[in-house]
């Protein structure tokens, strides 16, 4: 080609720079060139051409459009060091080439072994102490700092100086005693030396005494006891003036006494005794153990058809045994165990706290709240009851047996099976390559049960055939490829159902999250052929109007289906696979709803939050006195915006000595919460109560206030 007047040879306008980078980290060597025509760029390391993704798509080096060389991660071993070296970029066009300056790529290094570890030092209080250290070899050369008891030392304190590798403490105090660690650091990271102990002689004294504690049963508790002395005092613990029983207690290196899970028998007085040859000191503290209510069995969300009976379990424990009661969200009515059943009421609570609702109606749908109450606290759990109407929740048709891929001979006969079921009974139609079939072709007919027959096959009959089963509840399709050749079989192999594995059992739901459902099932009944694998199909009215295959080649009878939508009802069925084909489907699972997603907390538009909160209307119901010192507050919300973190229940005394005292708050920190229990109230006192929605620091409008007077004695049931 001729030299064009405006063309010019390459020149490098941005040269690569030396770089030091940690192993495994990304980095870029820059290179930019000008020239006409635009030059091509290649890189060389130590004189050899560098392979990039242009040569091998799996390469960890990428040649960027700008000409820069990008390393996804620096590869560097003890011996193999393919990325370290001296790089140049070369820009070429037909007029010549330009070579950049050399740029070295060095891999930062920090070895593990210290050239000199600090050693233990013993000094008397008031004397100077010197700790020496030489960090590990590294590139760049590491610097050092010191830690005492895992906390970095501030060398601005006038008694402390750090020069080279030496830590010098003048005029030591007993508080200087501890474990000193030298830390070598560079861009790779940090390495800690072996710790060295600095001992400063002293008589036993307490730096930290144990303090009295009140805990809930099963909580961990720690009694601290920090001492110092010269020589180091021995520290031991006693309980109620006796040695500690073995096994229940864990004494840490800093002499902290820890009980992992407290029991009521752990109550008592704990004494820390510090002793050395020059003295003995004792410090004690008491432990009080309370047992708040706890759920043994929580109620769970259930989906039930009209007319059925549902039971929500709610078993609790605590000390004392909690009082359990139920309430439907939005209702003032409380249900207690052993309450005589009201005429026409279909709800009852068993002595163990289970709520049973008979002859389920649509109006029963909603959230049911189980609450447990003791002096040690209160808890509540919510479960949603969804009521389904069998007629409106019909799944789409199910294709029991669909067509199989097959290769047949010219002039042969094809039989493409399609057997479907459903309520209402589906209509079967066929498509070829997505278009209605058979049209007017007399060679093709759809037989009574839906099988497509094509006689006198031609090469042009090759293609993808799709059986579509359609009803008012949706449609389901199944495709197969027909290949017509000179050498195929003359007629379709008619698989007997006995060649196929039996259908698996009804899948059971064993776990549910926002985006997944875990299913388990049993293989087909004994006597049927075994399965080599399974497929799982799913249907959700809110996702599509057809069954979707959500898992293939499943080798086990327990499987977690992922990628589901939150807060969505799904049905599942399972088919078994063997080399001959697919079984009939299993029975459908019970409907299951995935968990709801929590509202987003980060990255929100504050104006939008404030606007939405301002539109929330909270309606406070009449508070209910549960005991002389506890009141239940319930409310409803006209519209639940995206941005709500919870509700602030505000209450104050309006009678008695502290009338119109300041507001006290109780936060219901769950956006879906619609009730709260106020505890530790005064007997026979009137309270004003209101509820306010909130999100982070933003707050919505208060509900109207309600007043309630606590009783002098327990209210009768």
């Amino acid at each position: 080609s001729r030299l064009r007047q405006e063309d010019f040879p390459p020149r490098i306008v941005e040269h690569p720079s030396d770089v030091i980078v940690s192993k495994g980290e990304p980095t870029t060597l820059n290179c930019k060139a000008e020239g006409r025509p635009t030059p091509t760029i290649e890189w060389y390391k130590d004189g050899e051409r560098v392979e990039t993704d242009k040569d091998d798509p799996r390469s960890h080096r990428m040649l960027l459009p700008s000409g820069s060389l990008f390393f996804l991660r620096i590869v560097h071993g003890r011996r193999s060091k393919p990325d370290e070296g001296s790089y140049v970029c070369v820009a070429r066009n037909y007029l010549g080439e330009a070579v950049s300056r050399n740029a070295s790529l060095e891999v930062a290094l920090l070895r593990d072994d210290f050239r000199q570890n600090p050693t233990d030092v013993v000094v008397a209080a008031g004397e100077p102490a010197i700790l020496e250290c030489q960090p590990p070899r590294g590139h760049p050369e590491p610097t050092i700092y010191w830690k005492k008891d895992k906390v970095r030392i501030d060398d601005k304190e006038e008694r402390i100086s750090i020069r080279g590798g030496k830590l010098m403490i003048s005029n030591t105090r007993k508080s200087d005693a501890g474990m000193y660690t030298c830390v070598g650091t560079n861009m790779v990271g940090e390495r800690d030396s072996d710790p060295a102990e600095l001992t400063v002689f002293e008589r036993p004294t307490f730096l930290r005494r144990p303090i009295n504690q009140v805990v809930l049963e099963e909580e961990a508790v720690e009694f601290r006891c920090q001492v110092q002395g010269d020589p180091q005092p021995t520290v031991r613990w006693k309980k109620d003036d006796a040695d500690l029983p073995r096994g229940r207690y864990d004494i840490k290196d800093d002499y902290t006494l820890r009980i992992k899970k407290t029991m009521s028998t752990d109550e008592g007085t704990y004494m820390c005794i510090a002793e050395n040859r020059v003295g003995k000191m004792e410090a004690s503290a008491t432990l009080t153990v309370r047992a708040p209510p706890q759920f043994v069995v929580r109620p769970r969300d259930q989906i039930v058809a009209q007319g059925r009976t549902v039971t929500f379990p709610c078993e609790t424990k605590g000390n004392p045994q909690p009082a359990v009661f139920w309430q439907k969200e939005g209702s003032q009515n409380l249900l207690f165990p052993n309450q005589p059943q009201q005429p026409n009421s279909r709800c009852s609570v068993s002595p163990t706290g289970d709520l049973t609702i008979t002859n389920i109606q649509r109006s029963d749908a909603g959230y049911y709240i189980c609450q447990a109450l003791t002096v040690a606290g209160s808890i509540l759990a919510k479960a949603q009851l969804e009521v389904t109407d069998v007629l409106t929740d019909r799944p789409p048709p199910i294709i029991l047996q669909g067509p199989a891929n097959q290769t047949l001979a010219v002039d042969g006969t094809a039989l493409l099976k399609c057997k479907a079921t459903g309520d209402p009974l589906p209509v079967i139609s066929w498509l070829k390559e997505g278009f209605t079939f058979p049209g007017r072709d007399p060679r093709a007919t759809i037989q009574e049960q839906g099988t497509l027959q094509i006689k006198n096959l031609r090469i042009s009959d090759t293609g993808t055939y799709t059986c579509v089963a359609t009803s008012s509840s949706g449609e389901t399709s199944w495709s197969a490829v027909l290949d017509v050749t000179e050498s195929g079989a003359t007629i379709s192999k008619n698989y007997d159902l006995s060649d196929l594995p039996g259908p698996p059992s009804k899948p059971q739901v064993t776990d549910v999250t926002k985006n997944s459902v875990t299913l388990s099932w049993q293989p087909g009944t004994p006597g049927t052929l075994p399965a080599s694998a399974y497929i799982i199909e799913a249907f959700s009215q809110s996702v599509s109007n057809s069954w979707q295959t959500v898992a293939n080649h499943v080798k086990t009878t327990l499987y977690t289906v992922r990628g589901l939508r939150p807060n969505t009802i799904y049905l599942f069925m399972v088919r078994a696979i063997n080399p001959q084909g697919l079984s009939d489907p299993s029975p459908m699972s019970d409907p299951v709803r995935t968990q709801d997603i929590s509202p987003p907390a980060q990255g929100v538009d504050h104006r939008q939050v404030q606007k939405e909160l301002g539109d929330v209307l909270v309606r406070l119901h009449n508070p209910v006195v549960l005991t002389p010192t506890t009141v239940q507050v319930t409310w409803t919300v006209d519209r639940q915006p995206q941005f709500i973190q919870g509700y602030r229940v505000m209450y104050r005394q309006t009678s008695g000595l502290q009338a119109t005292s300041s507001w006290q708050n109780l936060d219901a920190k769950v956006p879906t919460e619609r009730s709260a229990v106020l505890v530790n109230l005064k007997k026979g006192v009137t309270y004003e109560i209101k509820v306010r929605p909130y999100f982070n620091e933003f707050q919505g409008m208060d509900s109207e206030s309600k007043t309630v007077r606590t009783t002098e004695e327990a209210p009768s049931a």
Partner: antibody, heavy 118, light 105 residues
């Protein structure tokens, strides 16, 4: 793609030498150490040493020093392992293997069977 | 030289079993340990490097753990294709363990 291809099987007499080649392709030959490992029939893996293709440096365990030579030809991206003064207990499959930047042998040759028999 | 001791030398197991193989170094090798699988007539294949990192393309049922002198290779649910011999290798001095043959029970 990245691969190592070794020379074919050899039959040698005791006292002779054998030279096995290992042709590397699909990566920068000089960027990765090459190791040799052998496996006698029914036995485990035995490391024989390495060569740095960049500069020809080598290292061998005590057992093989003086009997094994490792070389390379960067122009044809090939490594060689020569074992001299062969004995019957040198009968084994000899493998070359590339050492990755993660200090492991990530790519192996297909192996070369060397039989030493009188 | 740092010696590598692998145990057991062989074991019988069934498909679906959890299998554990151990490897002990005669002195600390930090996390410089690799695991390989070898099938008869084939070259070894890298499974785990740096004691616990899974090599690209290796099924997640294989896992490695340990540091210092004691290391473990675990196959969480043995598959038919997993019956083979497994070797540990320390990447400081590059010596291999004696191997563990996993056979069908």
């Amino acid at each position: 793609q990245v691969q190592l291809v070794q020379s074919g099987a050899e039959v040698k007499k005791p006292g002779a030498s054998v030279k096995v080649s290992c042709k590397a392709s699909g990566y920068t030959f000089t960027g990765y150490y090459m190791h040799w490992v052998r496996q006698a029939p029914g036995q485990g893996l035995e490391w024989m040493g390495w060569i740095n293709p960049k500069n020809g440096d080598t290292e061998f365990p005590q057992k093989f020093q003086g009997r094994v030579t490792m070389t390379r030809d960067t122009s044809i991206t090939t490594a060689y392992m020569e074992l001299s003064r062969l004995r019957s207990d040198d009968t084994a499959v000899y493998y070359c293997a590339r050492e990755s930047g993660d200090d492991a042998f990530d790519i192996w040759g297909q192996g070369t069977m060397v039989t030493v028999s009188s | 030289d740092i010696q590598m001791t692998q145990s057991p030398s062989s074991l019988s197991a069934s498909v679906g079993d959890r299998v554990t193989i151990t490897c002990r170094a005669s002195q600390s090798i930090s996390s410089y340990l690799n695991w390989y699988q070898q099938k008869p007539g084939k070259a070894p294949k890298l499974l785990i490097y740096a004691a616990s990192s899974l090599q690209s393309g290796v099924p997640s049922r294989f896992s490695g753990s340990g540091s210092g002198t004691d290391f473990t290779l675990t196959i969480s649910s043995l598959q038919p294709e997993d019956f083979a011999t497994y070797y540990c290798q320390q990447s400081v001095g590059l010596f291999f363990g004696g191997g563990t043959k996993v056979e069908i029970k």
